[in-house]
C-alpha cells in the first residue's frame, strides 16, 4: 500500500493510474467504502463523504489513464486509506496529514520560549527535526520546545515530518521582538552632543506600546527615570522628562533620544524597556556613556573618563608628532608640567581609538 | 440517545422566507453533517441539503438558489433559511443526522418533523 | 440527480403474506441503497442499508437484494405493524434522492 504524507491547509493528489490509457468507469473510496468521487459517462460525481467539497479529479487526464483525486485543503482527519477501483482491479492510498502550529503568537520577545506542537493522525508515530535561521537544529515528537529565543532566531523555521521514510516539510515564520543590539555604548568628549539610537530587529505594521529609560550615573547612589514615551502605530509621543538632563526623543522610530550635552554627572548606563500592546514581558537594550575630559591647571595635565569602561581599555596621553606619552588601563591619566603643543587624550581598546581629546599646552613664561 | 426538535413558524407568506431552526440535544453537534428533509402531505421524501459542522454545506440543485443553512456549535443548533416560498413549499419538514459508517451513509436520527403551510 | 423509481406505489396483502418492493435507479449506484419505513405521523425509520445489510434490532423478516440499478426489499411474513410506507434511497451520489414510497395496506 502506498503511503502519502499530506501538510494541513495544502493540496493532496492521490494517483491512480489505468493499464489502459483510455476514458473508463473508476470511483474512489475512503476505508468506510463510502464512494467520494467516479464517473458517470463523461461527468465526475460526486458521493456523500466528507470530502464531497473538497475532492475533485483531472478531467483533462482521464484519457490517458489517470484518474487521480486531489483534496483540498486538508484536514488532520482525512487521514484514511482511500481505495482507487478502475478496471477491476483496487488501488489503495493511505494519506497521511500532518499539521505543525507554533503554540502562541508567531511574534515572540527575545527570552521567551517556542513551543511548536505536531498534529497528526492517531495511530501514526512520527519524528520531527526543525532548523533555525541560524542553523541551529532541534528535534522532537509531538512537541518541540526552544526554551530562550535568540535574536537571531528570527525568520523561517524549517521542519521536517517523517514517518514510513517519507517525509513533509513545514515553513514558519517566528518574530523575535528584540533590539538590533543588547547593548551600545556611547564614547563622547564632555560638552558634545549625544545620540542615543534604539533601532528594533523587526516589523509589524501596528506598533503599539510604552517605554521607559531608566539611568544610573556613575556619580549617583541611585537610579532614576530619565524619560517615558509612548508608542502608537510607529509614532512617538514623550509622555514624562526629567529637567535634568532635559533629553529630546525623535517622534519616528528608531527609538531616538539625543542629549544636549555630555558630562561627566551623566556618564553611566541606562536601560531602555519597551513594553508592547498585547504582549507579555518587554524588550530591553542597555546603553552606556562614557564621556572623556582633558583639563590643564597649573602645572598638571589631566585626562579623565567617566562611566562603565573595561579594564582592559588604555587612557593615553600623548604630545603630538613627538613620542612622549602616559598610558594607563585607568580611568585617569596626567602628565606633570607638560611640554608646549598640541596633546591628544585617547581612550583605546587593542590600539583601535574608541575616543580622543585634544588640548593646547602653551608655553609659561 | 441524541433527539432533534425542530422550531419556527408555521405558516409563511407566499414570497417571503422560511426560517427553520433545529435543537440538537443529549449528544454533540461536533463532526456531524445534519440535513433538512421535507415531504409534502401524501407525497415522498425530498433532501433538501446538509451542513458540516466546520459551516461547510451540499444544497439540492433544484432548491439550491433559494437556500441557506448555517450552524451555531455553541447553541448546538443548526438553521434553514428558504427563500421567495410558494404552495409548492408546503410540507412537514424534518431535521436529521447524516452518518457514515463502514459501508453505509444515510440518516439515523430525525426530528419529530414540523408542518409549515404557504398560504397568504 | 440519480432518479429512483419505486414500484408499486401501494399495495394490499394479508397477515403472513411475502411482500416485495422494487427501486430502479436511473444509473448504477453499486450496493449504495438505504430502505426506511415511515408509520403515519412518524419520521422514517432505517432498515436495510447497502442494499442488502439488516440494520442492528429490525426483524429478520425484512430483507433487500440488488446491485447496479436494480433493487428488491422483501418482508417475508407481513405483521400488523409493518403497515407503513416504504422508501428507497441512494447514496452513490449527491444530492441524495428517494423513491416515491410504497405504501404497504393489509387486506
Known amino acids: 500500500k502506498k503511503v502519502v504524507l499530506g501538510k494541513k491547509g495544502d493540496t493532496v493528489e492521490l494517483t491512480c493510474n489505468a493499464s489502459q490509457k483510455k476514458n473508463t468507469q473508476f470511483h474512489w473510496k475512503n476505508s468506510n467504502q463510502i464512494k467520494i468521487l467516479g464517473i458517470q459517462g463523461l461527468f465526475l460525481t460526486k458521493g456523500p463523504s466528507k470530502l464531497s467539497d473538497r475532492a475533485d479529479s483531472r478531467k483533462s487526464l482521464w484519457d490517458q489513464g489517470c484518474f487521480s483525486m486531489i483534496i483540498k485543503n486538508l484536514k488532520i482527519e482525512d487521514s484514511d486509506t482511500y481505495i482507487c477501483e478502475v478496471e477491476n482491479k483496487k488501488e489503495e492510498v493511505e494519506l497521511l496529514v500532518f499539521g505543525l502550529t507554533a503554540n502562541s503568537d508567531t511574534h515572540l520577545l527575545e527570552g521567551q520560549s517556542l513551543t511548536l506542537t505536531l498534529e497528526s493522525p492517531p495511530g501514526s508515530s512520527p519524528s520531527v527535526k526543525c532548523r533555525s535561521p541560524g542553523g541551529k537544529n532541534i528535534q522532537g515528537g509531538r512537541t518541540i520546545s526552544v526554551p530562550q529565543l535568540e535574536r537571531q532566531d528570527s525568520g523561517t523555521w524549517t521542519c521536517t515530518v517523517s514517518q514510513d521514510q517519507k517525509t513533509v516539510e513545514f515553513k514558519i515564520d517566528i518574530v523575535v521582538l528584540a533590539f538590533q543590539k543588547a547593548s551600545s555604548t556611547v564614547y563622547k568628549k564632555e560638552g558634545e552632543q549625544v545620540e542615543f539610537s534604539f533601532p528594533l530587529a523587526f516589523t509589524l505594521e501596528k506598533l503599539t506600546g510604552s517605554g521607559e529609560l531608566w539611568w544610573q550615573a556613575e556619580r549617583a547612589s541611585s537610579s532614576k527615570s530619565w524619560i517615558t514615551f509612548d508608542l502608537k502605530n510607529k509614532e512617538v509621543s514623550v509622555k514624562r522628562v526629567t529637567q535634568d538632563p532635559k533629553l529630546q526623543m525623535g517622534k519616528k522610530l528608531p527609538l531616538h533620544l539625543t542629549l544636549p550635552q555630555a558630562l561627566p554627572q551623566y556618564a553611566g548606563s541606562g536601560n531602555l524597556t519597551l513594553a508592547l500592546e498585547a504582549k507579555t514581558g518587554k524588550l530591553h537594550q542597555e546603553v552606556n556613556l562614557v564621556v572623556m575630559r582633558a583639563t590643564q591647571f597649573q602645572e598638571n595635565l589631566t585626562c579623565e573618563v567617566w562611566g562603565p569602561t573595561s579594564p582592559k581599555l588604555t587612557l593615553s596621553l600623548k604630545l603630538e608628532n613627538k613620542g612622549a606619552t602616559v598610558s594607563k588601563q585607568a580611568k585617569a591619566v596626567w602628565v606633570l608640567n607638560p611640554e608646549a603643543g598640541m596633546w591628544q587624550c585617547l581612550l583605546s581598546d587593542s590600539g583601535q581609538v574608541l575616543l580622543e581629546s585634544n588640548i593646547k599646552v602653551v608655553p609659561t613664561w | 440517545q441524541v433527539q432533534l426538535q425542530e422550531s419556527g413558524p408555521g405558516l409563511v407568506k407566499p414570497s417571503e422566507t422560511l426560517s427553520l431552526t433545529c435543537t440538537v440535544s443529549n449528544g454533540s453537534i461536533s463532526d456531524y453533517y445534519w440535513s433538512w428533509i421535507r415531504q409534502p402531505a401524501g407525497k415522498g421524501l425530498e433532501w433538501i441539503g446538509r451542513?458540516?459542522?466546520?459551516?461547510?454545506?451540499n444544497y439540492n440543485p433544484s432548491l439550491k438558489s433559494r437556500i441557506t443553512m448555517s450552524v451555531d456549535t455553541s447553541k448546538n443548533q443548526f438553521s434553514l433559511e428558504l427563500s421567495s416560498v410558494t404552495a409548492a413549499d408546503t410540507a412537514v419538514y424534518y431535521c436529521?443526522?447524516?452518518?457514515?459508517?463502514?459501508?453505509?451513509?444515510?440518516?439515523?436520527?430525525w426530528g419529530q418533523g414540523t408542518t409549515v403551510t404557504v398560504s397568504s | 440527480d440519480i432518479q429512483m423509481t419505486q414500484s408499486p406505489s401501494s399495495l394490499s396483502a394479508s397477515v403472513g403474506d411475502r411482500v416485495t418492493i422494487t427501486c430502479q435507479a436511473s444509473q448504477d449506484i453499486s450496493n449504495y441503497l438505504n430502505w426506511y419505513q415511515q408509520k403515519p405521523g412518524k419520521a422514517p425509520k432505517l432498515l436495510i442499508y447497502?442494499?442488502?445489510n439488516l440494520e442492528t434490532g429490525v426483524p429478520s423478516r425484512f430483507s433487500g437484494s440488488g446491485s447496479g440499478t436494480d433493487f428488491t426489499f422483501t418482508i417475508s411474513s407481513l405483521q400488523p405493524e409493518d403497515i407503513a410506507t416504504y422508501y428507497c434511497q441512494q447514496y452513490d451520489s449527491l444530492p441524495l434522492t428517494f423513491g416515491g414510497g410504497t405504501k404497504v395496506e393489509i387486506k
Open positions: 451542513i458540516y459542522t466546520s459551516g461547510s454545506t
Open positions: 436529521a443526522r447524516e452518518l457514515e459508517r463502514y459501508y453505509f451513509y444515510g440518516v439515523d436520527v
Open positions: 447497502a442494499a442488502s
